[in-house]
């Protein structure tokens, strides 16, 4: 069964800067990746970035840099100040779509006990949705 993992890290050098990394563990080609915060993409969350494997990347503040790391994983750097700044308990969600086969989404947040800049290796997060 395909799975999605999400890793959230706060940068030690800039405490208002977060890095979100997401990956898809499964076979099949990914047609779109959507990163959101405040909840899942289809349940009131706000889209931060969308990445298409061939047509490019779109992103919205406070997203600073979204990129593909591999064919099945992405990273997103967030940089905020004031109202648009993420906080330590913000939930980030990643949705990997493979049209028309289905989509898989998982969410994560900064580990409560982690120090800035330190993070455990990514582990598969529970699948919230599979069409």
């Amino acid at each position: 069964t395909p799975e999605v993992w999400v890793q959230v890290r706060m940068e030690a050098t800039e405490l208002s800067s977060f890095t979100i990394r997401c990956g898809f563990l499964g076979s099949g080609s990914i047609s779109l990746v959507t990163v959101s915060w405040g909840g899942p993409n289809g349940a009131g969350g706000t889209t931060l970035a969308v990445l298409h494997p061939e047509r490019g990347i779109r992103q919205w503040a406070p997203a600073r840099q979204a990129r593909w790391e591999t064919q099945s994983s992405i990273s997103l750097i967030l940089e905020g100040s004031g109202a648009s700044s993420p906080c330590a308990n913000t939930t980030f969600c990643c949705k990997f779509a493979s049209f028309p086969e289905g989509s898989w989404e998982a969410c994560g947040s900064l580990p409560p006990s982690s120090d800035p800049g330190l993070s455990a290796p990514p582990t598969p997060a529970p699948i919230l949705r599979a069409d």
Epitope: V50, H52, R55
Partner: nanobody
Framework: EVQLVESGGGLVQPGGSLRLSCAAS????????MGWFRQAPGKEHEGVAH???????RYVDSVKGRFTISQDHAKNSLYLQMNSLRAEDTAVYYC???????????????WGQGTMVTVSS
């Protein structure tokens, strides 16, 4: 959660017409296009038509002049009027909500289960 439910598919003779409907509910922030994709048996899927957030309809060349896409915002519905149908229009048609990456492409973020259109005599 976003829900898209298509209806209106079926068997039609060449030259005939069908109207597909898509009932939409739920919410995805920042999506800026809604449209129809299709996948013929054994073939790659293709975008048939979509409407931008500015209301401009766009069509793949093979359906221009034959298909018309429209929206009813009050009913949260999308439609595809298909006229002068041909055998090569046979496919599963999917209603999609997505993101624009260029003028002619709406990348699907959410889609329905699909409705089968068969054009045959």
């Amino acid at each position: 959660e976003v829900q898209l439910v298509e209806s209106g598919g079926g068997l039609v003779q060449p030259g005939g017409s069908l109207r597909l409907s898509c009932a939409a509910s739920g919410y995805t922030s920042r999506t800026d296009c809604m449209g129809w994709f299709r996948q013929a048996p054994g073939k790659e899927h293709e975008g048939v038509a979509h409407i931008d957030s500015d209301g401009i309809p766009r069509y793949v060349d093979s359906v221009k002049g034959r298909f018309t896409i429209s929206q009813d915002h009050a009913k949260n519905s999308l439609y595809l009027q298909m006229n002068s149908l041909r055998a090569e229009d046979t496919a599963v048609y999917y209603c999609v909500v997505g993101f624009k990456f260029d003028e002619d492409y709406c990348a699907p973020n959410d889609w329905g289960q699909g409705t089968m259109v068969t054009v045959s005599s």
